[in-house]
Interface confidence: medium
């Protein structure tokens, strides 16, 4: 008995060939001997089967002795043994229809689980193997689960169902809803304007929800909500914003926030959350702000940074074009009785300068100038 695998919703063509290369009488029946279709001369006739409106044949092939049964919009319950009766012969074809669906929506939040469920006909014992867009293979039976979806899991998942040494392939497009970056850090000199950007790693027709940026300033004992906003069909509107600092927000995607001035009291870390309509859970992006200040008070030249710096970052004070006078893995460095000239305060990581602030030290009889 020939075995043919089909996919739910697809079209399958079951072949039946006569030894004579001409149009002769044929019938297709199911295992209950109910006629599906056949011919009456050059006319296609249909029987009382459940397939009535979905069954067809190719009249153009009859003259060549080929009498296919075409079943459109396959259903799992179409799985059956189909019998072609032609020239006093019976050809049997076993059709097995499978369906593979994602547990819920195919748009899932980062960190959520994806469950793929195989629909299969009774009596079948298929195995399933799926390959993610990043090449990760998972195997299973009726259900396959992937926990903690990552951004790289976005794309086409290719799943192969194996039954009776035959294969059928499914492709499922999965969109992982996430920000492009889980975390970002912005380095600014005191007084500079700060731009925070939160690009999304996906595109959808309509995007509706709400978001909030909670901020934990390094100097503050508790976090506070800096801004709450609404997202409606990719249009952003501010619902509520704290008075200090008075953030501004772009009206279009990507989500964009502007802090008018970087000040030591704002240095710290924030968590932007985005709740999307009809989705449980939220998208998160962490953002960090490091602020630098260089000052001269009497005979003391000081450079300080505030905010979440890693212990391996180096803070240095140097006179332009000279070796660093002081260099420490600390958040404040100073030089007593600095020479006159342009001093540079540098925050660096493995030799790469992340932030630089210049301060001009005048001869002792005048006051310092900060460019």
């Amino acid at each position: 008995k020939k075995v043919v695998l089909g996919k739910k919703g697809d079209t399958v063509e079951l072949t039946c060939t006569a030894s004579q290369k001409k149009s002769i009488q044929f019938h297709w029946k199911n295992s209950n001997q109910i006629k599906i279709l056949g011919n009456q001369g050059s006319f296609l006739t249909k029987g009382p089967s459940k397939l009535n409106d979905r069954a067809d044949s190719r009249r153009s092939l009859w003259d060549q002795g080929n009498f296919p049964l075409i079943i459109k919009n396959l259903k799992i319950e179409d799985s059956d043994t189909y019998i072609c009766e032609v020239e006093d012969q019976k050809e049997e074809v076993q059709l097995l229809v499978f369906g593979l669906t994602a547990n819920s929506d195919t748009h899932l939040l980062q960190g959520q689980s994806l469950t793929l469920t195989l629909e299969s006909p009774p009596g079948s014992s298929p195995s399933v193997q799926c390959r993610s867009p990043r090449g990760k293979n998972i195997q299973g039976g009726k259900t396959l689960s992937v926990s903690q979806l990552e951004l790289q899991d976005s794309g086409t998942w290719t799943c192969t169902v194996l039954q009776n040494q035959k294969k059928v392939e499914f492709k499922i497009d999965i969109v992982v809803l996430a920000f492009q970056k889980a975390s970002s850090i912005v380095y600014k000199k005191e007084g500079e304007q700060v731009e925070f950007s939160f690009p999304l790693a996906f595109t959808v027709e309509k995007l509706t929800g709400s978001g909030e940026l909670w901020w934990q300033a390094e100097r503050a004992s508790s976090s506070k909500s800096w801004i709450t906003f609404d997202l409606k069909n990719k249009e952003v509107s501010v619902k509520r914003v704290t008075q200090d600092p008075k953030l501004q927000m772009g009206k279009k995607l990507p989500l964009h926030l502007t802090l008018p001035q970087a000040l030591p009291q704002y240095a710290g870390s924030g968590n932007l959350t985005l709740a999307l309509e009809a989705k449980t859970g939220k998208l998160h992006q962490e953002v960090n702000l490091v602020v630098m200040r260089a000052t001269q008070l009497q005979k003391n030249l000081t450079c300080e940074v505030w905010g979440p710096t890693s212990p391996k970052l180096m803070l240095s004070l140097k006179l332009e074009n000279k070796e660093a006078k002081v260099s420490k893995r600390e958040k404040a460095v100073w030089v007593l009785n600095p020479e006159a000239g342009m001093w540079q305060c540098l925050l660096s990581d493995s030799g790469q300068v992340l932030l630089e602030s210049n301060i001009k030290v005048l001869p002792t009889w005048s006051t310092p100038v900060q460019p």
């Epitope: 709400s210 909030e212 004992s221 509520r240 704290t242 200090d244």
Partner: antibody, heavy 119, light 107 residues
Framework: EVQLVESGGGLVQPGGSLRLSCAAS????????MSWVRQAPGKGLEWVAN????????YYVDSVKGRFTISRDNAKNSLFLQMNSLRAEDTAVYFC????????????WGQGALVTVSS | DIQMTQSPSSVSASVGDRVTITCRAS??????LAWYQQKPGKAPKFLIS???SLQSGVPSRFSGSGSGTDFTLTISSLQPEDFATYYC?????????FGQGTKVEFK
């Protein structure tokens, strides 16, 4: 555990004044907007006023504007509602509530304080 | 001000029934809608925000849907502790406004 406890309710004559207090605990009070909501006997809920985290933004329902004042003391984790020129229609149970989450819902409520305005 | 209209004003039901309460806003409020449950002599209890986000600890038999002007609260299988009054509330613009309430009572 978030707790909100109202006090200061009682019987007052029309035209009189009353000050309600709400003591908050179990969360960082200075990080949240707070609201007052009232419920007249046998009636539904009516939002009265709210105040932002540091107390410099305040909003009121039209029926109490100019008569009621919402305020807060973050150092004492306390919310207040000063009610002047009270009318019979102000008779209600007054609830203090925290506005939490990005959908600005009233996620925690006090048990309420009854204010009766009657001569 | 945005008017919130709930229907029905009361519903008689039995344990195990599916109960649906609707709330209509006089103008579009996106998803800025919350649902609360209140029992006699008690403070309201927060159930749902953002029209459909269930507050943690609230049983999954409660669900919310809708956006714009039309919203629904559904209790899939009514339990004895669910007999109460339910209110919707908009947080789209000041003043916040509540629906008049829907009382779910024993049939």
């Amino acid at each position: 555990e978030v707790q909100l406890v109202e006090s200061g309710g009682g019987l007052v004559q029309p035209g009189g004044s009353l000050r309600l207090s709400c003591a908050a605990s179990g969360f960082t009070f200075s990080s949240y907007w707070m609201s007052w909501v009232r419920q007249a006997p046998g009636k539904g809920l009516e939002w009265v006023a709210n105040i932002n985290e540091d107390g410099n933004e305040k909003y009121y329902v039209d029926s109490v504007k100019g008569r009621f004042t919402i305020s807060r003391d973050n150092a004492k984790n306390s919310l207040f509602l000063q009610m002047n020129s009270l009318r019979a229609e102000d008779t209600a149970v007054y609830f203090c509530a925290r506005e939490g989450g990005q959908w600005l819902a009233l996620d925690h409520w006090g048990q309420g304080a009854l204010v009766t305005v009657s001569s | 001000d945005i008017q919130m209209t709930q229907s029905p004003s009361s519903v008689s039901a039995s344990v195990g029934d599916r109960v649906t309460i609707t709330c209509r806003a006089s103008q579009g409020i996106s998803s800025w809608l919350a649902w609360y449950q209140q029992k006699p002599g008690k403070a309201p209890k927060f159930l749902i925000s953002g029209a459909s986000s269930l507050q943690s600890g609230v049983p999954s038999r409660f669900s919310g849907s809708g956006s714009g002007t039309d919203f629904t609260l559904t209790i899939s299988s009514l339990q004895p502790e669910d007999f109460a009054t339910y209110y919707c509330q908009q947080a789209n613009s000041f003043p916040w406004t509540f629906g008049q309430g829907t009382k779910v009572e024993f049939k």
